[in-house]
């Protein structure tokens, strides 16, 4: 019996454990996506709608903010489109590029995590266009530090939340 | 404010080209595109094509395409629309017209047409 | 190649009466219609943007409603300067008019 209440406490820490394990999945905000036709910072995101769930971390002013150290697999997925009921392309030739950028308070500095993207020619024959770019690491991660997101062309991008997301979730502790 | 000024009424004999000028003013012309549109009389108006000021990139309905050029002078702010081989279902009132679009904000040409030139009548008759 | 239909092709009303023009699309253009004003001798003028949108400086009596291929644009109360004819657009295309006179 005293190994079976032992085995239901250990159950109980394990799960409140997992329970605290700091993740993020946040969503494009599709009503204010910024505009400029050169890298801009995207700041406005879902955090409690839809797809949307955060845990133990922080979002603030456009950013995704550690609370616990530790080492974190960050994450972004980011589609661009271009139907021609919108209109044309000014130019064909586009470079459709996402920076993952981490920022510390502390020491202030700002280092670029993950890229990814391509140069592409969209035809003005075609319809439809379409291009998505995911990243993905491991990253040793500190209290106060900030994860955002930079794109190039947002005019472009897709807003729908299974489409345009970024998130980060906890591995381990850092020994 | 923002105003597009185009040249004068033009006659011309089939065969012939014309050229039609827009001057623009009160906004930064290499941010914008410019489009031309024109009506035949009796008819609905009738998109040609569009440059984007900035860098000089146009495109063109099909209808016009091989007889249609169009340029811009972005030191004189000045759009030109010329059509080559003339015939008398071209005459018609010529439009140019700037696209809301800000070049600067994105790169989609959206086909608001937020001001107009007053127009310029070309008449081909032999 | 879309097709715009408008109708009324032309319509007369008396001052003060409310003025509705309608638009078709021949297939799915979200919301990214446009209406014009024009009068002869004159510049074309933007009324409506983006389907319900009023341009800066257009007088609130016009409005804009629809969405996919269904349009209307809605004069609520009809003045003397509103005789023109009134054009819709998507992108390339163009509706074929719609002449408003005063009875």
């Known amino acids: 019996e005293k190994a079976m209440v032992d085995g239901s406490w250990l159950d109980l820490a394990k799960r409140s454990k997992l329970e605290a394990q700091p993740f993020a999945h946040l969503t494009i905000n599709a009503t204010d996506i910024p505009s400029g036709s050169h890298k801009v910072s995207l700041s406005s995101w879902y955090h409690d709608r839809g797809w949307a769930k955060i845990s133990n971390m922080t979002f603030s002013n456009g950013k995704l903010i550690v609370n616990q150290d530790g080492f974190y697999y960050l994450y972004a997925n980011i589609c661009f489109r271009h139907h021609e009921t919108s209109g044309d392309l000014a130019t064909e030739y586009l470079q459709l590029m996402v920076y993952v950028t981490k920022t510390s308070i502390k020491i202030p500095s700002s280092h670029t995590l993950m890229k990814g993207g391509s140069t592409k020619y969209w035809s003005g024959n075609s319809e439809f266009h379409f291009y998505s770019i995911n990243v993905g690491g491991f990253f040793k991660l500190r209290s106060g530090e900030e994860i955002s997101i930079e794109v190039s062309n947002p005019s472009l991008l897709d807003p729908d939340q299974d489409a345009t997301y970024f998130g980060a979730f906890k591995v381990r502790d850092i020994d | 404010q923002v105003q597009l000024v185009q040249s004068g009424a033009e006659v011309r004999k089939p065969g012939a080209s014309v050229k039609v000028s827009c001057k623009a003013s009160g906004y930064d012309f290499s941010n914008y595109a410019i489009h031309w549109v024109r009506q035949a009389p009796g008819q609905r108006l009738e998109w040609m094509g569009w440059i984007n000021a900035g860098n000089g990139n146009t495109k063109f309905s099909q209808k016009f395409q091989g007889r249609i050029t169009v340029t811009r002078d972005t030191a004189a702010s000045t759009a030109y629309m010329e059509l080559r081989s003339l015939r008398s279902e071209d005459t018609a009132v010529y439009y140019c017209?700037?696209?809301?679009?800000?070049?600067?904000?994105?790169?989609?040409?959206?086909?608001?047409?937020?001001?107009w030139g007053q127009g310029t009548l070309v008449t081909v008759s032999s | 190649e879309i097709v715009m239909t408008q109708s009324p092709s032309s319509l007369s009303a008396s001052v003060g009466d409310r003025v509705t023009i309608t638009c078709r699309a021949s297939?799915?253009?979200?919301?990214?219609l446009n209406w014009y004003q024009l009068k002869p001798g004159k510049a074309p003028r933007l009324l409506i943007y983006g389907a319900s949108s009023l341009q800066s400086g257009v007088p609130s009596r016009f409005s804009g409603s629809g969405s996919g291929a269904e349009f209307t644009l809605t004069i609520s109360s009809l003045q003397p300067e509103d005789i023109a004819t009134y054009y819709c657009?998507?992108?390339?295309?163009f509706g074929q008019g719609t002449k408003v006179e005063i009875k």
């Open positions: 657009q998507h992108t390339r295309a």
């Open positions: 017209a700037r696209d809301d679009s800000n070049m600067v904000r994105g790169i989609i040409i959206a086909y608001y047409f937020d001001y």
């Open positions: 297939q799915s253009i979200s919301r990214y």
